[in-house]
């Protein structure tokens, strides 16, 4: 007989495009030895899994590299990690534990993942005042980006003389040496999420003081 178990937590989760979400899953505490097998996450109605730890099983092209089964039977963990969320990931998913040698396995309840438009925008921080002729470091940050996602691409646009400084997964530094004529001009930080094909930007007006 196919055995059923309930996924703990909410029946649906929301994630913004390009970001990450963890679909929580805990294996049943009483798991007969013969039922132990590989773990598979399925999109409702599909035969090919979106994620698995079965070395002989293919996963859906659309989710390869973005959906991962977090497998740790010692901690009863069978959670699904989704990164670089895309609009078409919007669906119901369920987990199945099964050995290919056995007729039956364990199937979880369904959980819906809702993928919304990205509403977060980059932050631009300026340390103090911008002085004409003096270099200053501006930081464009996206603190809401998850570390395990595909690193975003940062682009800066400004008429002022600039040079790129260090960057991390979540931030990019721009060194700017403003001139008097750069006062009230626009500076834009554009962030693209290549995993989901989404671009967000923030524009500020430069306030340059004269030395």
């Amino acid at each position: 007989q196919e055995r059923r178990f309930q996924l703990e937590g909410p029946e649906s989760l929301t994630v913004q495009e390009g970001l990450c979400v963890l679909v929580p899953c805990r294996l049943p505490t009483t798991l007969p030895a013969s039922y132990y097998g590989y773990g598979y996450w399925f999109l409702e109605g599909a035969d090919v899994p979106v994620a698995t730890n079965d070395p002989d099983e293919e996963v859906q092209e659309e989710t390869r590299g973005r959906f991962h089964l977090l497998w740790d039977p010692r901690r009863k963990n069978c959670s699904l990690s989704i990164r670089d969320a895309r609009r078409r990931d919007n669906a119901a998913y369920f987990f199945r534990l099964k050995s290919k040698w056995m007729k039956y396995g364990y199937t979880s309840s369904k959980l819906s993942v809702r993928v919304m438009a990205l509403t977060h925008r980059p932050n631009i921080s300026i340390p103090g005042t911008l002085e004409s002729g003096h270099p200053s470091n501006l930081t464009c940050s996206v603190p809401w980006v998850c570390e395990q996602g595909t690193p975003p691409i940062f682009s800066w646009m400004s008429a002022a003389p600039t040079s790129l400084g260090p960057r991390t997964t979540q931030s990019s530094v721009l060194t700017i040496t403003p001139r008097p004529q750069d006062h009230s001009t626009n500076l834009t930080c554009q962030v693209t999420f290549p995993g989901a094909g989404v671009t967000m930007e923030r524009t500020i007006q430069l306030n340059v003081s004269y030395a």
């Epitope: 030895a33 070395p55 002989d56 039977p73 010692r74 290919k100 040698w101 007729k103």
Partner: antibody
Framework: EVQLLESGGGVVQPGRSLRLSCAAS????????MHWVRQAPGKGLEWVAV????????HYADSVKGRFTISRDNSKNTLYLQMNSLRAEDTAVYYC?????????WGQGTMVTVSS | DIVMTQSPSSLSASVGDRVTITCRAS??????LNWYQQKPGKAPKLLIY???SLQSGVPSRFSGSGSGTDFTLTISSLQPEDFATYYC?????????FGQGTKLEIK
């Protein structure tokens, strides 16, 4: 009570054939994967073959591939191992065992001796 | 094929001792590791599956740990009935290979 009872073992000459049977009782045989595991005298366990619940999927150890065939008859609750072209190194106790990726029930074994 | 290597091959211990047997896989097998106990003239018996899950009816003095390539079976306090041969087996991919065994003897 879950039980597996092997039969068909005996003494056979090299190159000859032998068919082992395993009668299952106490569980829904047609829902379980089944294995054959062998143990040469004084040696360790050697996994031989596995068959899926419906017989559609089979895998073998390299040492027996092409010579041994695992099969099942779910209507008779019986597992089989057809052993052809037997060699001296096939001499062992053959265990029938239940399970998927984990063997949880074992039979008591049947002895196969390949000798001229 | 995945090669399973157990150590030690044999081990002498006394009742009440804490004993650890290790098993190493030639490649990562995640948590797909089972431990069996076999007494002379008897069929093997499942002790631990999924590297650390205790089979129903097996005393809690037996425990398993590990993931990837390195695994251990621990008997916290040896009892007279624990003197036997222990085998690890990987069930990650066929052929489902066994370790060569560890014979646990009375000191």
């Amino acid at each position: 009570e879950v039980q597996l009872l092997e039969s068909g073992g005996g003494v056979v000459q090299p190159g000859r054939s032998l068919r082992l049977s395993c009668a299952a009782s106490g569980f829904t045989f047609s829902s379980y994967g089944m294995h054959w595991v062998r143990q040469a005298p004084g040696k360790g366990l050697e996994w031989v073959a596995v068959i899926s619940y419906d017989g559609s999927n089979k895998h073998y150890a390299d040492s027996v591939k092409g010579r041994f065939t695992i099969s099942r008859d779910n209507s008779k609750n019986t597992l089989y191992l057809q052993m052809n072209s037997l060699r001296a190194e096939d001499t062992a106790v053959y265990y029938c065992a239940r399970g998927g990726q984990t063997i949880d029930i074992w039979g008591q074994g049947t002895m196969v001796t390949v000798s001229s | 094929d995945i090669v399973m290597t157990q150590s030690p091959s044999s081990l002498s211990a006394s009742v009440g001792d804490r004993v650890t047997i290790t098993c190493r896989a030639s490649q990562s097998i995640s948590s797909y590791l089972n431990w069996y106990q076999q007494k002379p003239g008897k069929a093997p018996k499942l002790l631990i599956y999924a590297a650390s899950s205790l089979q129903s009816g097996v005393p809690s003095r037996f425990s398993g740990s590990g993931s990837g390539t390195d695994f251990t079976l621990t008997i916290s306090s040896l009892q007279p009935e624990d003197f036997a041969t222990y085998y690890c087996q990987q069930s990650y991919s066929t052929p489902y290979t066994f370790g060569q065994g560890t014979k646990l003897e009375i000191k």
